[in-house]
């Protein structure tokens, strides 16, 4: 089951119409928020959650501050989440850092990682 923070993030990003991810704009059969949220790939949701956490952890995103925060970002939450977080950071840490340092939005970073793909079946 998806955690409430996933839904909160998805809602926040859906409201940000100007910078929304192209795949968020694709409405589901009912065209409702829940369907759209569920259509997001799990990796994309993970990415949004981590990038937003990192943003909150640093006053100003620099190579130094973000790389320091990146070592701590996966330390909170349930162990299953920590494993997902660590696996994601192992794969994308450098690139996420670069995006944050350059002032990219969470959506831009996660889209650029080609994670903005609707899932093929139920999560």
């Amino acid at each position: 089951r998806l955690s409430p923070e996933y839904y909160d993030l998805a809602r926040a990003h859906l409201r940000d119409e100007e910078k929304s991810c192209p795949c968020l704009a694709q409405e589901g059969p009912q065209g409702d928020l829940l369907t759209k949220t569920q259509e997001l790939g799990a990796d994309y949701r993970t990415c949004l959650t981590i990038v937003q956490k990192l943003k909150k952890m640093v006053d100003k995103p620099t190579q130094r501050s973000v790389s320091n925060a990146a070592t701590r970002v996966c330390r909170t939450g349930r162990s299953a989440w920590r494993d997902v977080c660590r696996n994601f950071m192992r794969a994308y840490q450098s690139r996420v850092t670069q995006g944050l340092v350059a002032g990219e939005t969470a959506q831009q970073i996660c889209e650029d990682l080609r994670l903005c793909i609707p899932s093929t079946g139920p999560l």
Epitope: R64, T97, A102, G103, E104, Q108
Partner: antibody
Framework: QVKLQQSGAEQARPGASVKMSCKAS????????MHWVKQRPGQGLEWIGF????????DYNQKFKARTTLTADKSSTTAYIQLSSLTSEDSAVYYC????????????????WGQGTTVTVSS | DIELTQSPASLAVSLGQRATISCRAS??????????MHWYQQKPGQPPKLLIY???NLESGIPARFSGSGSGTDFTLNIHPVEEEDAATYYC?????????FGGGTKLELK
């Protein structure tokens, strides 16, 4: 080929403002941040700040923040720097330089520079 | 701010010899096993030109006689063999901390 074409020399009175431009061509404007660097006559290089044309994010060197405004126009692929409340200390050459948002776009440094705009402040 | 100290401030080298320029940072500029230190060459009346990025990567189109090394706080730019066109001022620059900073520059002259 990549080109950063800067506007012509500026003469200004103390207290006035100047706005310089940097027209980018030969690459995808939104895949690079645009940095600005100051060089006083016979002196070294000083980093002013950068703008991300993709997100509009700006990062300023605290030393320049109060009197400097960086903007960018995606449609014309042009970056701008405005300096206000000019003093003789602002007399310098101002360079724009691109920097990739992600390291796989190119060398992760300021790899192309404009020719510079000379600003002279005198009464 | 991360302070970059270049040495020497100037040096004179004979054609064909080695020029070594040092850059010391007030704190480490490393993360993820990478060093966020770059080297530029500037000739009078011209903009700086990227030579080396992330400590040791040679920029495309730059002759192989230029090389960079170092990590953490100590970095070196080597030019060997020095050619006439290498007479210029060389700057190191870090992009690890905010604000980005440049070294004071090293002026290379030919004997």
């Amino acid at each position: 080929q990549v080109k950063l074409q800067q506007s012509g020399a500026e003469q200004a009175r103390p207290g006035a403002s100047v706005k310089m431009s940097c027209k980018a061509s030969g690459y995808t404007f939104t895949k690079y941040t645009m940095h600005w660097v100051k060089q006083r006559p016979g002196q070294g290089l000083e980093w002013i700040g950068f703008i991300n044309p993709n997100s509009g994010y700006t990062d300023y060197n605290q030393k320049f923040k109060a009197r400097t405004t960086l903007t960018a126009d995606k449609s014309s692929t042009t970056a701008y720097i405005q300096l206000s409340s000019l003093t003789s200390e602002d007399s310098a050459v101002y360079y724009c330089a691109r920097y990739p948002i992600y390291s796989d776009y190119g060398p992760y440094a300021m790899d192309y520079w404009g020719q510079g705009t000379t600003v002279t402040v005198s009464s | 701010d991360i302070e970059l100290t270049q040495s020497p401030a100037s040096l004179a080298v004979s054609l064909g010899q080695r020029a070594t320029i040092s850059c010391r940072a007030s704190e480490s500029v490393d993360s993820y096993g990478d060093s966020f230190m770059h080297w530029y060459q500037q000739k009078p009346g011209q903009p700086p030109k990227l030579l080396i990025y992330r400590a040791s990567n040679l920029e495309s189109g730059i002759p192989a006689r230029f090389s960079g090394s170092g990590s953490g706080t100590d970095f070196t730019l080597n030019i060997h063999p020095v050619e006439e066109e290498d007479a210029a001022t060389y700057y190191c620059q870090q992009s690890h901390g905010d604000p980005y900073t440049f070294g004071g520059g090293t002026k290379l002259e030919l004997k």
